[in-house]
């Protein structure tokens, strides 16, 4: 499956929206930095097959959608930007779902990518626990926003690589 150019543009638009969502000076939040343990190995295009990488992207976007759909998130961010962000994520989920089922059958995908999907879920679990521990403070959300931007950037770069390999 060739990920459509629109997916890459959507990813870039999602990143821009995330960048625009910042509300407080990042400099005041340095003490809240945290190692969430981004599962980089899951997205390593050389080590894993394309279907696995796409499956991991899908899980990451789904989990991002879940994270930013909570009532705590709604209270933290600008509603208009958040709505636009949801639309971009929803579009990307549709693109990736089509790609995943095209690459391999649904049953095979579920079995083959269990470990990588679990790694992504655990990563987001760590993010959620961090936010809870910080009582969803503005700085905690800033740190999470920066972390999601970094993971999105990483997956965008890898998607470019996947398209070049086709």
């Amino acid at each position: 499956c060739d990920l459509p150019q629109t997916h890459s543009l959507g990813n870039r638009r999602a990143l821009i929206l995330l960048a625009q969502m910042g509300r407080i000076s990042h400099f005041s939040c340095l003490k809240d930095r945290y190692d969430f343990g981004f599962p980089q190995e899951v997205f390593d295009g050389n080590q894993f097959q394309k279907a696995q990488a796409i499956s991991a992207f899908h899980e990451m976007i789904q989990q991002t959608f879940n994270l930013f759909s909570t009532k705590d998130s709604s209270a933290a961010w600008d509603e208009t930007l958040l709505d636009k962000f949801y639309i971009e994520l929803f579009q990307q989920l549709n693109d990736l779902e089509a790609c995943v089922t095209q690459e391999v059958g649904v049953e095979e995908i579920a079995l083959m990518n269990e470990d990588s999907i679990l790694a992504v879920r655990k990563y987001f679990q760590r993010i959620t626990l961090y936010l809870m521990g910080k009582k969803y403070s503005p700085c905690a959300w800033e740190v999470v926003r920066a972390e999601i931007m970094r993971s999105f950037s990483f997956s965008t770069n890898l998607q470019k690589g996947l398209r070049r390999k086709d």
Partner: antibody
Framework: EVQLVQSGAEVKKPGESLKISCKGS????????IGWVRQMPGKGLEWMGI????????AYSPSFQGQVTISADKSISTAYLQWSSLKASDTAMYYC??????????????WGQGTLVTVSS | DIQMTQSPSSLSASVGDRVTITCRAS??????LNWYQQKPGKAPKLLIY???SLQSGVPSRFSGSGSGTDFTLTISSLQPEDFATYYC?????????FGQGTKVEIK
Amino acid sequence: EVQLVQSGAEVKKPGESLKISCKGSGYSFTSYWIGWVRQMPGKGLEWMGIIDPSDSDTAYSPSFQGQVTISADKSISTAYLQWSSLKASDTAMYYCARHPGLNWAPDFDYWGQGTLVTVSS
Amino acid sequence: DIQMTQSPSSLSASVGDRVTITCRASQSINRFLNWYQQKPGKAPKLLIYAASSLQSGVPSRFSGSGSGTDFTLTISSLQPEDFATYYCQQAIDLPFTFGQGTKVEIK
């Protein structure tokens, strides 16, 4: 390959203005902050200030607040450090370095080669 | 501002020696501490970040430890290329501040 390339050495007279640069390449310039560090001859490192090139938000050390201005042009992946009126005590080596911002990653992992500023009448 | 105090300010050692440099913060900085190496005429180089994480490409003879206010940089077996000045830096809050430096010289 990640690189921070600084502008060349400068010799200036007291009272003159100056703007030195730091150009980033090999990475997403707006994903990292750029910090500036001063080192006077034979002395230690002094942190001057920092900029987030994504929105040009800046923060300064109290010692340098009002003495220098930090700016960035993300369209050309370049950060700047400028003086409106140099003093002899500004004679030093100035380094730029990148910082991962709020992300958990090595701080100041790449540095520019330094710009030597000499202020003398 | 958070003050960083390094000790000693200089030391003489021989190749193969185990060298320890300490850094003390004026208030708790958790583990937000970095160590840099600087050689004459060169830019500083990051050795250790987050108190104990070894920066990519840095030899394993360098190690860092500590948390709160007291930190240590250890060179397990000093090599000729390790003669330089070492700086600690707190990274928990702005303004970032450096220690005054420790110069490691040949005995």
